[in-house]
C-alpha cells in the first residue's frame, strides 16, 4: 500500500525507522515509532518482520570478528513511499539504514528515474553511531518543487563492494493544469468548419476542458483533456480560449484569434523607379493580405493617348518582390499604371493609378542614300546622305555618328565622328593611302544611336591618282558597293 504524506498534514516526511540508541521495537506505524535504547538485532534485520522492505537487493555480511555468529543481511528501512505535494512547496525525504560497526567506508548516492543525482542538490548523509550499529540517514531536500521534480527516487549504498538499493520514493508534484497543447490562431474560410485542439495535464488528473468563444463558454459539459473543438463555420472574426480544470484549480490558455479570409486590400504607393524608352520599373506596397497569403499580382498598363484604342495591357507577376519591370512599351509615350494582387479568395481592387512616361527611343532607321567619294586634291573623303524618316517616339534628331574603317595590308583601324543634326554631308581626312575605307552612318537622338547604314567602301589609291566616280549606298538587294579602279 502507498503511504501518502500530503504537505498539508506535515511539512516533511519524518524519519521513520530506528535511530541509534533508540531502535525500533514496534512495527505498528511506519511514520512514527516508539524507541528504546536497546539493540535488538533480530528485529532490526529480520526479513520476516512486517513493516520493512526486503527487496532481495541486500548485502549479506560475513562472519563477525569473533567468528561465532552470522550477521543478518542489510537493507534500507521502509520510508514513506509516495509524497504528494503542491508546486513551489519544499519537500524533504530520506533513506535510512543501520549498519553494523564492523563495516567501513559506506557511501550513499541518490538516483532519480534511473539517473544518479549529482551536483546542485541539497543532499546530506548523516551518521549516528551506537555501540554496535551506525544509523545512516541520507536526506534529500528540494526547495520550491517543480513538475520536473516528479519521479521515482532511490538510495544506493555501496558497502564492501556490494550494492544495496532502497525502495523507491515517488514524488508527485501537483499543481494547476499545465498546457501541453494550446489552440493556435487560424485564418479560415467563411462558413467552413475547422478544429481547435487543447490539451493540459496534471497532476492531479483528470483535467477537464471548457471552451470559450468571445468570452462565452461553448460547451456546457466539460471534456476530458485532450479536447478537440469542431467549429462549424464563422462569418466574422472570433477569439477562442480553453479553460483547464483540475482539483487544484483552473488555468486559462492564451486567447487565439480566428480570422475570416477575405480578398486583399489594394496595393498602395505604386512608385516609378526607372524609365527607359521601352520599359518602366515600378514598385508597390502590398495591401492587407486578407488573412491569406498573396499568390500573385497583376500590373495593368493603359496608354494615355487620345488616338490609342484604350486597350489595357496586363502583366502577371509573382507577389514578391513587390517590383516589376514593364517591357515592350513604346518610346516617348505616356501610360497609366495600376496594380492588383490576389490571394486564394480573389483579386484585390486595383491600386490608385499613377502616370508614367517612357523616354525617347533611338532612331529605328538608318540615314538613306549614303554616297562616298574621294577628293584627292584635298586628301579627304566626302560623305553625303539623306535624313532618315524617324518616328516621333524616337525623339528629336541631335546628330549623326559616322564610322569609317581603314584597311590595308593586314592593318584595320576604325574611327568614329560625330556631326550635328543640321548636316547631311561630312568630310573626313584620308588616314591611309593604298587602302580601303568603309563608311557607315547612324542617326542619333537623345534616346540613343540608331542602326548604322549599310557599309559603303571606297579604295584610296597612292598619291597622284585621279578622281573617280563616287561610291554610294546600293539599291536594296544589291551587293555591297565597291569602287572599281
Amino acid at each position: 500500500a502507498i503511504t501518502e504524506a500530503r504537505e498539508e498534514a506535515k511539512p516533511y516526511p519524518l524519519f521513520p525507522g530506528p535511530l541509534p540508541g533508540s531502535l525500533q521495537t514496534d512495527h505498528t506505524s511506519l511514520l512514527s515509532l516508539p524507541h528504546t535504547s536497546g539493540y535488538q538485532p533480530a528485529l532490526m534485520f529480520s526479513p520476516t518482520q512486517p513493516g520493512r522492505p526486503y527487496t532481495g537487493n541486500v548485502a549479506i555480511p560475513r562472519v563477525t570478528s569473533a567468528g561465532s555468529k552470522l550477521l543478518p543481511p542489510l537493507a534500507f528501512k521502509h520510508t514513506v513511499g509516495h509524497i504528494i505535494l503542491s508546486e513551489h512547496k519544499d519537500v524533504k525525504f530520506n533513506c535510512s539504514i543501520s549498519v553494523p560497526n564492523i563495516y567501513q567506508d559506506t557511501t550513499i548516492s541518490w538516483w532519480k528515474d534511473g539517473k544518479e543525482l549529482l551536483g546542485a542538490h541539497h543532499a546530506i548523509t548523516q551518521f549516528y553511531p551506537d555501540d554496535e550499529v551506525t544509523a545512516i540517514i541520507a536526506s534529500f531536500s528540494i526547495t520550491s518543487v517543480q513538475r520536473s521534480d516528479n519521479g521515482s527516487y532511490i538510495c544506493k549504498m555501496k558497502i564492501n563492494n556490494e550494492e544495496i538499493v532502497s525502495d523507491p520514493i515517488y514524488i508527485e508534484v501537483q499543481g494547476l493544469p499545465h498546457f501541453t497543447k494550446q489552440p493556435e490562431s487560424m485564418n479560415v474560410t467563411r462558413n467552413t468548419a475547422f478544429n481547435l485542439t487543447c490539451q493540459a495535464v496534471g497532476p492531479p488528473e483528470p483535467v477537464n476542458i471548457f471552451w470559450v468563444q468571445n468570452s462565452s463558454r461553448v460547451n456546457e459539459q466539460p471534456e476530458k483533456s485532450p479536447s478537440v473543438l469542431t467549429v462549424p463555420g464563422l462569418t466574422e472574426m472570433a477569439v477562442f480560449s480553453c479553460e483547464a480544470h483540475n482539483d487544484k484549480g483552473l488555468t486559462v490558455s492564451k486567447g487565439v484569434q480566428i480570422n475570416i479570409k477575405a480578398i486583399p486590400s489594394p496595393p498602395t504607393e505604386v512608385s516609378i523607379h526607372n524609365s527607359t524608352a521601352h520599359s518602366i520599373l515600378i514598385s508597390w506596397v502590398p495591401g492587407f493580405d486578407g488573412y491569406s497569403p498573396f499568390r500573385n499580382c497583376s500590373v495593368q498598363v493603359k496608354e494615355v493617348d487620345p488616338l490609342s484604342n484604350g486597350s489595357v495591357m496586363i502583366f502577371n507577376t509573382s507577389a514578391s518582390p513587390h517590383m516589376y519591370q514593364i517591357k515592350q512599351l513604346q518610346a516617348l509615350a505616356n501610360y497609366s499604371i495600376g496594380v492588383s494582387c490576389m490571394n486564394e479568395i480573389g483579386w484585390s481592387a486595383v491600386s490608385p493609378w499613377i502616370l508614367a512616361s517612357t523616354t525617347e527611343g533611338a532612331p529605328s532607321v538608318a540615314p538613306l542614300n549614303v554616297t562616298v567619294f574621294l577628293n584627292e586634291s584635298r586628301d579627304n573623303v566626302d560623305i553625303r546622305w539623306m535624313k532618315p524618316l524617324t518616328k516621333r517616339q524616337a525623339g528629336e534628331l541631335v546628330g549623326y555618328r559616322i564610322s569609317h574603317v581603314w584597311q590595308s595590308a593586314g592593318i584595320s583601324k576604325e574611327l568614329l565622328e560625330e556631326v550635328g543634326q543640321n548636316n547631311s554631308r561630312a568630310q573626313i581626312s584620308v588616314q591611309v593611302h593604298n587602302a580601303t575605307c568603309t563608311v557607315r552612318i547612324a542617326a542619333v537622338t537623345k534616346g540613343g544611336v540608331g542602326p548604322f547604314s549599310d557599309p559603303v567602301k571606297i579604295f584610296i589609291p597612292a598619291h597622284g591618282w585621279v578622281d573617280h566616280a563616287p561610291s554610294s549606298t546600293p539599291a536594296p538587294g544589291n551587293a555591297d558597293p565597291v569602287l572599281i579602279i
Epitope: K10, P11, Y12, L14, F15, L19, G21, S22, S32, L33, P34, H35, S37, K92, N94, H122, I124, T125, Q126, F127, Y128, P129, I137, S139, S141
Partner: antibody, heavy 122, light 106 residues
Framework: QLQLQESGPGLVKPSETLSLTCAVS?????????WGWIRQSPGKGLEWIGS???????YYSPSLKSRVTISVDTSKNQFSLKLNSVTAADTADYYC???????????????WGQGTLVTVSS | AIQLTQSPSSLSASVGDRVTITCRAS??????LAWYQQKPGKAPKVLIY???SLESGVPSRFSGSGSGTDFTLTISSLQPEDFATYYC????????FGQGTKVEIK
Amino acid sequence: QLQLQESGPGLVKPSETLSLTCAVSGYSISSGNYWGWIRQSPGKGLEWIGSVDHSGSTYYSPSLKSRVTISVDTSKNQFSLKLNSVTAADTADYYCARNTMIRGVMDWFDPWGQGTLVTVSS
Amino acid sequence: AIQLTQSPSSLSASVGDRVTITCRASQGISSALAWYQQKPGKAPKVLIYDASSLESGVPSRFSGSGSGTDFTLTISSLQPEDFATYYCQQFRSYPTFGQGTKVEIK
C-alpha cells in the same frame, strides 16, 4: 512566532536527578522536527545532550547516553530532560532548542530558549 | 564523535576590521556546518548554515565558506555589536560544537 522556555529547579544535590522542562509556544511539537537540549558549563563551550521528536524517538550524546532520558508530551506541547547521578561537573546553563530538519534529521539549532542555570551542590 | 577545533580561541580587533575565524573538523563533514554568535547572558543565535548560507535577517557582512574539514567565518567589517563569542557546529553526525572564539575590542 516559535518560542521556547526552560523551567526547573536551579539547584540539584549531587547524585540526584536533574529535571528540566521546555515549554514550546507558537508552534506545535507534533508538526515535526527534533527538540534538543544543550548545556554550557560556566566559561566553557556548548555541549549537546540529546534530542527527541514528537513520537518519542530519541538521540542521545554518546558521552551522556547512560544518564539521560528525554521525553515529549505533545498534549502539553513540551519536552523534558532528566539527567541522573549528577555531579558538580553537570553545573551549567541548560538550553532547549529546536533542531531544524531542513537538510537532514538533526541539523542546526534555531531558535533557542533563553537558558536556565542549574547548580549541582550539596 | 566528530571534534571541531576553532582558532583562534580569542582575538582583539577594532571596528571596521576584517575578522576571520576558522573551524577544523576531525573528519570530513561535507558542508554540514553552522556558525553561531553568543553574547554574554544570551542564548546562541545562528548566523550561517550549510557552511555558507546566510540565515535570514543576518547582516551580509557575515559570510561562511569551506567544505570537508576546513571552514571559515568572515566578518568583512567588524561593527560594535559584533563583539561576542562565535561557535561552529557540525551536523554530519551527533551535533558537536567548537570550543568558541571570543572577539574582543582592541
